[in-house]
Interface confidence: medium
């Protein structure tokens, strides 16, 4: 079996992660997607999935966690509010299909919530390419009274890219509409 | 309480474009988890669905009706509507606007909120 | 298209008697699978969701069961007021597909 390499992403309590997944459209569009913890040692907690019928965009609630799901952009959106320390592990976006073996979107989050200082970042997880499926970071500084990464990410911002990926910067108020194409 | 009411001409002639619009109050048609559909009813038949259409725009239609079909939404107005094609007498039925929903905890979507029906004759 | 297929398409009752509805999916469809209650005049009216759990503010003399291809909508003890056409519905796949009504007529 394939191993991924995982990506880690550092939060401070009561942030907001947001990660984004791209899918294939071609091979996906009607299938169930999920994000799932993978606890040391035991099956992978699946923690919130997509619902009937599956083409549709859809948007599912579940807890902290939030599946935003958009099959006309091919595109699978995670969102976890008000981080704990006891968050922290190791997640995945995946096409889930049981009693099958799930499909893995792409790379492990490997998340690291810590108590922290206010003077951190906020990641969100945008993908540049729908070839390799990797994901890119852009990062946005923290202040105590925002606690939400939103859609329009402030200036200036970082970018911290995947191996290989050649990406050096990119406009936080773009990052939105970065093109995935095929 | 969640209410939608239907509006538009009742009397619809052969070939021209029939047109609704669904107003919906008590609740923002910008929600996430609500699809909002058109479903009619030929007089004295069954329910046939129409399509949907999400606040972010993104619709579906049924095969059948697909060609002729049209639904948009305005979130600024809380409505959205229906556009019908080339119009015969077999478009002649109650439509309904409804809410499809999907709220978590409920494992399938239903049409939970529907409007009282507004009937369309195609007549020249 | 998934094609739902109602049981019998009309039946005659009495008040207090058990009535039962089937619906037959073409194909599996789990428990995605409600059941609405339609008065001549009126829009319809949810009763059951995914199969078999009862909608807020419905009576529990109604009820639902079934997953797969063959559910069930069954009223305990037929009421004046329940007397109308009861329509099955997927939401498995879209297009949303419904039943071809069964019509509850007093005896």
């Known amino acids: 079996a394939i191993v991924l390499e995982e990506e880690r992403y550092d939060l401070v309590e009561g942030q907001t992660l947001t990660v984004k997944c791209p899918f294939n459209i071609m091979k996906y569009a009607n299938s169930q997607k999920a994000w799932q913890r993978l606890p040391d040692g035991k099956e992978p907690l699946t923690l919130v999935v997509t619902q009937r019928p599956f083409t549709r965009p859809s948007e599912v609630h579940m807890g902290k966690f939030t599946l935003k799901h958009d099959p006309s952009e091919a595109m699978l959106q995670v969102q976890m509010t008000d981080l704990q320390v006891t968050d922290s592990g190791l997640y995945r976006c995946v096409i889930y299909h049981p009693p099958n073996d799930p499909v893995v979107l792409f790379h492990p989050v490997r998340l690291v919530v810590t108590k922290g200082s206010s003077d951190v970042f906020t990641p969100v997880i945008i993908p540049i390419t729908r070839l390799t499926e990797r994901p890119i970071l852009i990062t946005t500084k923290y202040s105590p009274s925002d606690t939400t990464t939103t859609r329009s990410l402030p200036k200036p911002t970082a970018v911290v890219s995947s191996p290989g990926l050649g990406v050096t910067i990119i406009n936080g108020t773009d990052a939105d509409s970065v093109s995935t194409s095929s | 309480q969640v209410q939608l009411q239907e509006s538009g001409p009742g009397l619809v002639k052969p070939s021209q474009t029939l047109s609704l619009t669904c107003t919906v109050s008590?609740?923002?048609?910008?929600?996430?988890?609500?699809?909002w559909s058109w479903i009619r009813q030929h007089p004295g038949k069954g329910l046939e669905w129409i399509g949907y259409?999400?606040?972010?725009?993104?619709?579906y239609y049924n095969p059948s009706l697909k060609s002729r079909v049209t639904i948009s939404v305005d979130t600024s107005k809380n409505q959205f509507s229906l556009k019908l094609s080339s119009v015969t007498a077999a478009d002649t039925a109650v439509y309904y606007c409804?809410?499809?929903?999907?709220?978590?905890?409920?494992?399938?979507?239903?049409?939970?909120?529907w409007g009282q029906g507004t009937l369309v004759t195609v007549s020249s | 298209d998934i094609q739902m297929t109602q049981s019998p398409s009309s039946l005659s009752a009495s008040v207090g008697d058990r009535v039962t509805i089937t619906c037959r999916a073409s194909?599996?469809?789990?428990?995605?699978l409600n059941w609405y209650q339609q008065k001549p005049g009126k829009a319809p009216k949810l009763l059951i969701y995914?199969?078999?759990s009862l909608q807020s503010g419905v009576p529990s003399r109604f009820s639902g069961s079934g997953s797969g291809t063959d559910f069930t909508l069954t009223i305990s003890s037929l009421q004046p007021e329940d007397f109308a056409t009861y329509y099955c519905?997927?939401?498995?796949?879209?297009?949303?597909?419904f039943g071809g009504g069964t019509k509850v007529e007093i005896k």
């Open positions: 519905q997927q939401s498995f796949y879209d297009p949303i597909t």
């Open positions: 995914a199969a078999s």
């Open positions: 409804a809410r499809d929903s999907s709220i978590a905890g409920r494992a399938t979507l239903s049409f939970d909120y």
């Open positions: 194909q599996s469809i789990s428990s995605y």
């Open positions: 008590g609740g923002s048609i910008s929600s996430g988890g609500y699809y």
């Open positions: 259409i999400y606040y972010s725009g993104s619709t």
